[in-house]
């Protein structure tokens, strides 16, 4: 298990911007304008435009609440004319540089509008959200703008009993069969679109790739499985000419695998989804939340997928069938038998045109019949190293993202940002071997659930964006000025932070900073190099005897012990003469004349099997 | 240049068989994705499809007349042919062949041959 | 269900806009086709997948599917659009393309 966060800032302790309208709630889409330096926000019945690098600055409001006659007759069907009632706002996508297209749960009727950006007018069009927004703000939806058509994962109905993966075009719109084996109860949690490889093969389509649990078609047992699921469908579908006529033809799904090896701790159930794309990195990887099922511990694992890993499923990958195996839990297996040509599911590509496959309507019944039968692969998608990055106890995930930094030396590191069911925000880095959690910032003043988060990676100015549903926190990467030695800073082991001697200040680290020389980091936690040693200062203190003193230190580091040392010699808690409060200030009983003297508390730090010692405070007593 | 012409008898006694063939030029039955169908229309009525195959062999049928349609192709020929069984005088009707298209703008009966009238009468 | 249902007729004025309307079930989850067909000749096909004009039909001809109707729009009406109009699908419960009922457009 992965070890505490090395440091806990409080809500107050950190520079940390908010942003909240008063009676405003559930701020839970987010989406940046990197070239505007706008974050919009959308909420129940609003959406804000606010200053990406202030977010408290508002710059345009625009309101889309739901009438009384509507709000009636959504009460009428039994929904909560409070809450339930009302315009959640659930998909928030760029549609050009001018506009947004919007949608909200509106009273249980799902409708879609474009936002005017220079007015900060909706125009009024009223589309109908069916399929692309959910009916309940309570269920699960996702979304993704790919040239300027609409992939959503969500409910298309007003029960939510008919699950949907959509793409809404004017052009060629596409759905997934209403059929138990392409989505059984799924509980969407993110969708994107993976470009082609420039230097993939020729012809290769863009794919959309969508995360999301299920209740497993494979195994039955008397309590419902859930099984985290990526699926994948082709840019380029058309859907089929006879045979799934208006469905996708490209629509694979396959099993996540995130469980600890030699152990029965599997995580299934998908909480967020983050795709890394940076310079350097040779393809994407997906890195994803997970908490088990029976979830009465508290656990929550972080798995990564290559691109290629994932492709390699659906592209080479076996698929599975539905099979009566009496007194059996498998309902499915293993297909062994003959696949048509072209392969079912795959894209339209340079290979497929070759062969006068020129779109997937000229795709063979055979293909088509066969993937409409056949949508679930029989491998699964494994992790990188085959393992969690990370497991952690006694907290619950709930969302992702990850930042590619370079350090001093030179090294790429990647660090996850990721939040909790309790307003915190966890950011830990994977090392060669470890994953070292770096810090937790308590984000919202009350404990209630990060419903989103986003990263802006611009350079010179990055910044974790996080919604709930009381306003939305922004907060830098790193707090390095909060580091006050070279040690503290050299063992925070954070690659955005690095011990300026020249300036005595643990400073943020910018890519592009020319005059880092002889700045100091060691994501190893290596601080021989801090030589600079603060100056020793003292605090004096005189008490009157039979009295009791309490000499204060203060110590971050949750990894480190605090020693208190008298005359050189350790003190223990265990003799009477002494006590600790809060494991860290001294209480010394019945002072004495003995009692006078230099006391030292130290902060001790393992790091890498190595003990890094820390004078922390020094104080002088003297007993009248 | 598209053309489909129908053949076949133009009377036909009731319990007998039909058979029709559709000879066509201007593309090939080989072509990924292209198929012939087969149509009819009874004198002042709608249009009822019947059968259809495609140039990978699949053949399709309309339900209510599944046990008593046959449609075959012969590609080096260009010709499709459809048998009907056991004729009775509500088969009395225009029957069409065509050609189906293929690809980003297909699905559509985009050729027609202008058809063949068969009357069944005893 | 594999019948689709079309009104049997449609008179419209000239310069007018004619609707011709077809419904069955779950029309929207498959691709409707329109025909048009003049006496003594096959048909010729005037809208296919819902909404997309082959070349050669005039702009006046637009489709529309949505929820269990697809609608036909002839604007601007001539009399050279009198004639039969059948709208088709492809039933996948039942792989078999099917017909519609057939509505006679006059132009008055």
């Known amino acids: 298990f992965a070890p505490v966060p090395r440091l806990t800032w409080e809500h107050g302790e950190v520079g940390l911007v908010q942003f909240h309208k008063p009676g405003i709630f559930n701020y839970s889409a987010l989406l940046m304008s990197e070239d505007k330096d706008t974050l919009y926000v959308g909420a129940r019945e609003a959406v804000f435009a606010v200053n990406a690098l202030n977010i408290s600055e508002k710059q345009h409001e625009v309101y889309w609440k739901v009438s009384e006659d509507k709000k009636s007759k959504c009460a009428e069907k039994g929904k909560s004319k409070q809450t339930e009632c009302l315009n959640y706002i659930r998909v928030l996508q760029p549609l050009s540089s001018t506009s947004l297209y919007v949608c909200g749960t509106n009273a249980f009727q799902p409708t879609c509008d474009h936002l005017n950006l220079t007015s900060f007018k909706f125009l009024g069009k009223s589309e109908d959200g069916k399929g692309r927004c959910p009916f309940d703000p309570a269920h699960s939806y996702t979304s993704v703008m790919v040239g300027g058509e609409l992939y959503s994962g969500t409910s298309y109905n007003f029960l939510g009993s008919e699950p949907i993966i959509s793409r809404n075009s004017s052009h060629s719109p596409l759905r997934t069969e209403y059929a138990i084996p392409w989505l059984n109860e799924p509980s969407f949690v993110f969708a994107d679109v993976i470009q082609k490889s420039p230097d993939g093969p020729e012809g290769e389509d863009d794919k959309v790739y969508f995360f999301f649990t299920e209740v497993s078609v494979e195994y039955e047992f008397v309590f419902k499985l859930m099984i985290p699921r990526v699926a994948r469908v082709c840019k380029g579908d058309q859907g089929g000419l006879r045979t799934l006529q208006k469905k996708w033809t490209s629509f694979l799904k396959a099993r996540l695998i995130c469980s600890k090896p030699d152990s029965g701790l599997v995580f299934n159930i998908l909480q967020d989804v983050f795709v890394l794309r940076a310079p350097g990195l040779k393809e994407p990887v997906f890195y994803a939340v997970f908490t088990p099922q029976l979830n009465n511990v508290g656990l929550s694992a972080v798995c990564a997928y290559t691109l290629a890993t994932v492709e390699a499923v659906f592209s080479r990958g076996k698929y599975m069938q539905s099979a009566t195996v009496e007194q059996s839990h498998t309902k499915w297996v293993r297909y062994n038998g003959p696949v048509p040509t072209p392969r079912p599911g795959a894209c339209i590509d340079s290979e497929a045109r070759a062969a006068n496959y020129t779109s997937s309507l000229n795709l063979p019944d055979k293909t088509l019949q066969f993937v409409k039968d056949h949508p679930l692969m029989d491998d699964s998608v494994t992790p990188i190293d085959n393992r969690p990055k990370l497991i952690k106890k006694d907290v619950n995930y709930t969302q992702i993202v990850v930042d590619r930094t370079q350090a001093l030396d030179g090294t790429f590191y990647d660090v996850m940002f990721i939040s909790t069911d309790r307003g915190a925000l966890h950011k830990a880095v994977i090392l060669t071997k470890e994953v070292h959690v770096i810090e937790e910032t308590q984000l919202f003043r009350d404990s209630e659930p990060v419903l989103t988060l986003l990263l802006s990676s611009k350079k010179g100015r990055k910044f974790v964006y996080a919604g709930s549903n009381s306003g939305v926190v922004q907060a830098p990467l790193a707090f390095c000025e909060k580091h006050g030695s070279c040690e503290d800073c050299v063992l925070a082991r954070d690659p955005y932070c690095a011990w300026s001697p020249a300036i005595k200040a643990c400073v943020t680290l910018h890519q592009e900073e020319a005059s880092s020389r002889g700045w100091i980091q060691d994501m190893s936690g290596d601080t021989s190099s801090c030589l600079d040693k603060s100056k020793e200062s003292f605090n004096q203190h005189f008490f009157k005897h039979g009295g009791t003193a309490e000499l204060k230190c203060f110590q971050k580091s949750n990894l480190a012990r605090v020693v208190w040392k008298f005359q050189n010699g350790e003190l223990k808690a265990a003799s009477p003469k002494y006590g600790f409060v809060g494991r860290k200030h001294l209480l010394i009983f019945n002072l004495s004349d003995g009692d006078s003297g230099v006391y030292q508390c130290l902060s001790e730090e393992r790091v890498r099997n190595k003990t890094v010692s820390q004078l922390l405070a020094k104080h002088v007593l003297e007993v009248k | 240049q598209v053309t489909l012409k129908e053949s076949g008898p133009t009377l036909v006694k009731p319990t007998q068989t039909l058979t029709l063939a559709c000879s066509f030029s201007?593309?090939?039955?080989?072509?990924?994705?292209?198929?012939v169908t087969w149509i009819r229309q009874p004198p002042g009525k709608a249009l009822e499809w019947l059968a259809l195959?495609?140039?990978?062999?699949?053949?399709y049928y309309s339900t209510s007349l599944k046990t008593r349609l046959t449609i075959s192709k012969d590609t080096s020929k260009n010709q499709v042919v459809l048998t009907m069984t056991n004729m009775d005088p509500v088969d009395t009707a225009t029957y069409y062949c065509a050609r189906i298209a293929s690809g980003d703008s297909g699905g559509y009966f985009a050729d027609w041959g202008q058809g063949t009238l068969v009357t069944v009468s005893s | 269900s594999s019948e689709l249902t079309q009104a049997p007729s449609v008179s419209v004025s000239p310069g007018q806009t004619a609707s011709i309307t077809c419904s069955g079930d779950k029309l929207d989850d498959k691709y409707v086709y329109w025909y048009q067909q003049k006496p003594g000749q096959p048909p010729v096909l005037v809208i296919y997948?819902?909404?997309k004009r082959p070349s050669g039909i005039p702009e006046r001809f637009s489709g529309s599917n949505s929820g269990n109707t697809a609608t036909l729009t002839i604007s601007a009406t001539q009399a050279l659009d009198e004639a039969d109009y059948y709208c088709q699908a492809w039933e996948s419960s039942s792989d078999q393309y099917v017909f519609g009922t057939g509505t006679k457009v006059t132009v008055l």
């Open positions: 195959i495609d140039w990978d062999d699949d053949k």
């Open positions: 201007g593309f090939s039955l080989t072509t990924t994705g292209v198929a």
């Open positions: 997948r819902d909404n």
